[in-house]
Each structure stands twice: as structure tokens, then as C-alpha cells.
């Protein structure tokens, strides 16, 4: 209303402090200078504003910065960040990792909100690639972040960033994503010795080709069954019984419990029953003795 637009005498805010929580919406609008709010944004987080009052403060900033807030303001938004829409955030140019951390902290412990997803997208696009420090930060707040990216987006991750990835960060990745990440991990860890290399590469092996699995089988790695079950079926099928035995080491006994599940089931169907019997695990379903196995894919390649 018209009579409410002027700030009442003596109510003009000289600083952002707790006295403002007693201001009505229209008083906040009329008595708080947007420039003052912008310079003292860091104080808002310590003041119990109502949701309605936060809407007013946001409106004041929107009027002051119609093209998008400057980073100096963004960094201190605190819980006012949660009042921003993805459309608001798309106007921002966030370049500082400190700003990103400050805003991720606001939503810490909760699922990734549309605001956070937009913020991360803006930040990563602005940087051009997902560097190690950014990846470190994002996976610390959101362990599943890496697996939320498409294979195309993952292709921009430099191998050096792979050092920041923890096994739990890959828990929800599908084979297509691991196909992209595995070669990067192989490159990143190439100078490590055998046992150390296996510890680092293990979480990425869902993207490994047959030849790499064959090479690992020569290194006494003792792969656990959980890792084996996540390997690509097409990469496991060509492995011989002897290679699988070497790859798994003492864990080979676990094959019996998994004989009905992929990739073990499909691998058993490709092995000679004689060879399976040498494991002494009672695995059934292999190719009976005396049967000739034709590798049609090899025949097609030759023709």
C-alpha cells in the first residue's frame, strides 16, 4: 500500500542486526538499504529471520543486482542461498572454490537440491574441466557426485583428478561411467607398484577390458568376490579357469555361492567342465567333455 512505502521515522537500518526481525515485511522493504545488505550479507546467517523476511531480503538483492549477484555477495549468502531458484543461480559467475564450499556447507548432510546442482554445473562449466580440487570438494559433500555425471561429462575429468576419488564415490556408477573412468585411473596410477596399484585401481575395474584382467591375474592380486562380480561380463568371459583362479587367489571359493549370478554364471557356461572340476568347488554347467567349441566371433573376424 502507498502509505507503507516510506520508512517510518527512526526505523532506517544503519546495520544488519537482530533488531530487524521485529520489522514487518513492508518495513524491511522500506528501511533496509540494499547496498547495506550486500556489504553485511555475512550477518544474515546469525539472525533468525522468518521465511517471509528472507523473501524480502532476496527481493532487495535482486533489485540491486538484476544481472546476477557478484561473488562477494554470493559467498556470504548462507541460508538465504536456499531461497534462490536455479534461474537465479544461472545468472551467477562463481569462480572461487571458497565460494562453492561456503554454499555447499549450507546444504551439508542433505541430498543435492536443484539449487546446488545448478551451482555445481555453473562452477564446473566456468572452470572448463573437473580439476582435482573441485572434485575433492564435491565428493566430500556428495560422495555420489561422480556417478551423477554422464559419460560425456566424465570425459572432461583429467586423469590427475582421479587421485581424489574414494571407493565409496563410485558405489552408484554404472558400467558406462566406469568405462570412461577406468582408462583415466589406469593412466593416473601407472607409476605405482603392483600391490599399491591394485588397491587404487580396484574400484575402477568395472570398466577394465579382458587383457587388463589377464595381466592382473599374473600379479597375485587376490581380488575379492565383490569386485569380481562388478566386472564387465564381456571382459570376464574370455578368461580361462586358470586365470580366474590366479585373479581371485584364496577368494576363488566364493565362486560357488555366486554360480547363478552374472558374470559367474555366463563365465561357467563358456568353460570346459573338466577345467571347472579342477577348482574342486562343484561348479556345474560347463561345456561337457568331448564337445568342440567354435569361436564364431574369431571365424567372422577372419572372413
Amino acid at each position: 500500500e502507498v502509505e507503507k512505502t516510506a520508512c517510518p521515522s527512526g526505523k532506517k537500518a544503519r546495520e544488519i542486526d537482530e533488531s530487524l526481525i521485529f520489522y514487518k515485511k513492508w518495513e524491511l522493504e522500506a528501511c533496509v538499504d540494499a547496498a547495506l545488505l550486500a556489504t553485511q550479507m555475512d550477518r544474515v546467517n546469525a539472525i533468525p529471520f522468518t521465511y517471509e523476511q528472507l523473501d524480502v531480503l532476496k527481493h532487495k538483492l535482486d533489485e540491486l543486482y538484476p544481472q546476477g549477484y557478484p561473488e562477494s555477495v554470493i559467498q556470504h549468502l548462507g541460508y538465504l542461498f536456499l531461497k534462490m531458484s536455479p534461474e537465479d543461480i544461472r545468472k551467477w559467475n562463481v569462480t572461487s572454490l571458497e565460494t562453492l564450499k561456503a554454499l555447499l556447507e549450507v546444504n551439508k548432510g542433505h541430498e543435492m537440491s536443484p539449487q546446488v546442482a545448478t551451482l555445481i554445473d555453473r562452477f564446473v562449466k566456468g572452470r572448463g574441466q573437473l580439476d582435482k580440487d573441485t572434485l575433492d570438494t564435491l565428493t566430500a559433500f556428495y560422495p555420489g557426485y561422480l556417478c551423477s555425471l554422464s559419460p560425456e561429462e566424465l570425459s572432461s575429468v583429467p586423469p590427475s583428478s582421479i587421485w581424489a576419488v574414494r571407493p565409496q564415490d563410485l558405489d552408484t556408477c554404472d558400467p558406462r561411467q566406469l568405462d570412461v573412468l577406468y582408462p583415466k585411473a589406469r593412466l593416473a596410477f601407472q607409476n605405482m607398484n603392483g600391490s599399491e596399484y591394485f588397491v587404487k585401481i580396484q574400484s575402477f575395474l568395472g570398466g577394465a577390458p579382458t587383457e587388463d584382467l589377464k595381466a592382473l591375474s599374473q600379479q597375485n592380486v587376490s581380488m575379492d568376490l565383490a569386485t569380481f562380480m562388478k566386472l564387465r561380463t564381456d571382459a570376464v568371459l574370455p578368461l580361462t579357469v586358470a586365470e580366474v583362479q590366479k585373479l581371485l587367489g584364496p577368494h576363488v571359493e566364493g565362486l560357488k555361492a555366486e554360480e547363478r549370478h552374472r558374470p559367474v554364471r555366463d563365465w561357467i557356461l563358456r568353460q570346459r567342465q573338466d577345467d571347472l572340476d579342477t577348482l574342486g568347488l562343484g561348479l556345474q554347467g560347463g561345456i561337457p567333455n568331448g564337445y568342440l567349441v567354435l569361436d564364431l566371433s574369431m571365424q567372422e573376424a577372419l572372413s
Epitope: 533468525p48 521465511y51 536456499l82 531458484s85 548432510g109 542433505h110
Partner: antibody, heavy 119, light 107 residues
């Protein structure tokens, strides 16, 4: 005066769903945040979920994440809690409660509605 | 999530006593702590917010103090109407966790 009235409780089998409602009056519903808090028989209070005034932000306790959904209809002055995949441990009195901002306590509570999950 | 630990879990007292209930947060919550009173079969009632601010209509014998991780609720002159269960609750984060409760019963 502020009034919050919960409804929708009852006996339900494990794995089934139930939707609770909370009808609000006596204040500007669209201005305030709303919460669900539950209390198992003979036990303490457990905060369940909150939804901001405009529905833009929702937060949940770990114990209900992925199973419960909080929502609101500001045109009807009503808060909802959709409860799926119910378990025996979800048996409780469910209260709705108001907060006025992210850094505000729960200043008004309903009288609660009892949900019993049992086969 | 922030854990809230109340002590004692039960407290026996007489009318006229001064009683103190303690609440500890697993990490700093500044002063964003509330105290509630609940009687059997009733909804909780807000007593204190922001650690020490008395909610409108609550008798002045109730007082709160503390900041950071240590908080106390004091009832200076226990009245018959005060026998109930008391809960602390942090609202520093959007997951507003409660303490496990303290039952104040007649000695």
C-alpha cells in the same frame, strides 16, 4: 488463534502406505515452515521432516529418507506426509508443528494422530 | 546429524525445589536451542527458544542458559504443574534433532 489438526492415522500393514494431513488455521499458512515430529509409544520425540513456506526446500530425518515425502498445499492450508514402505518402527503418534524460519523453533503443535504399523 | 544428549533421564524432586536439566550438542549449535515441556497424552509445548528466551505466556520460574555445546534448563521453584517430560532440540541445521528427554517426577 493458531490451530493445527492432524488426520489420516490408523492401522496399516508393514510395507503399505499411508497419507497424513494437517489442517492449519489462525495464521498465514503460506508464510511459515511446517514440520512433522513423531513419538513412538513410551519413547521420546523424533523430528521427521520440514518443508519451507513456499515448498522450495524439504529436509528429512535419515530414518525416513526415501520412504516419506512431505508436501503442502498453500491454497488449502494443508500439510501432508506421504508414508511408503511402512515398518513396525514407524508406529508412533505423528504431530505437525509450525516454524517461522530456518532458525526458529517449533512454536505451535497439533494434538497428533496415531499410526500403527502391524501385521 | 547433530546428536543431542540430555541428563539426567529421570529426576525426582519436590514442590519448591530448584531443578536443573542439562543438554549437550555433539557440535556447536551457537544458541539455536529450544526447550519443550510435554505432559502424558498431550502435544509438546515450547518453553524456551534461542537458549535463553522465554516464550510468551511461560512462567518466569523457567530459565535457560548456555551456548555452543552446553545448555541448561532451570526451574527455580518447582510447581505441581511442572511434573512432566522436558526435551531440548537444536535448530541450527535443517534436521532439527531432539534430546532423549528428562522426566521430572514427584519425589
Amino acid at each position: 488463534q493458531v490451530q493445527l489438526v492432524e488426520s489420516g492415522g490408523g492401522v496399516v500393514q508393514p510395507g503399505r502406505s499411508l497419507r497424513l494431513s494437517c489442517a492449519a488455521s489462525g495464521f498465514t499458512f503460506s508464510s511459515d515452515g511446517m514440520n512433522w515430529v513423531r513419538q513412538a509409544p513410551g519413547k521420546g520425540l523424533e523430528w521427521v521432516a520440514v518443508i519451507w513456506n513456499d515448498g522450495s526446500n524439504k529436509y528429512y530425518a535419515d530414518s525416513v529418507k526415501g520412504r516419506f515425502t512431505i508436501s503442502r498445499d498453500n491454497s488449502k492450508n494443508t500439510l501432508y506426509l506421504q508414508m511408503n514402505s511402512l515398518r513396525a518402527e514407524d508406529t508412533a503418534v505423528y504431530y505437525c508443528a509450525r516454524d517461522r524460519g530456518p532458525l526458529w523453533p517449533l512454536d505451535y503443535w497439533g494434538q497428533g494422530t496415531l499410526v500403527t504399523v502391524s501385521s | 546429524d547433530i546428536q543431542m544428549t540430555q541428563s539426567p533421564s529421570t529426576l525426582s524432586a519436590s514442590v519448591g525445589d530448584r531443578v536443573t536439566i542439562t543438554c549437550r550438542a555433539s557440535q556447536s549449535i551457537s544458541r539455536w536451542l529450544a526447550w519443550y515441556q510435554q505432559k502424558p497424552g498431550k502435544a509438546p509445548k515450547l518453553l524456551i527458544y534461542k537458549a535463553s528466551s522465554l516464550e510468551s505466556g511461560v512462567p518466569s520460574r523457567f530459565s535457560g542458559s548456555g551456548s555452543g555445546t552446553e545448555f541448561t534448563l532451570t526451574i527455580s521453584n518447582l510447581q505441581p504443574d511442572d511434573f512432566a517430560t522436558f526435551y531440548c532440540q537444536q535448530y541450527n541445521t535443517y534436521s532439527r534433532t531432539f534430546g532423549q528427554g528428562t522426566k521430572v517426577e514427584i519425589k
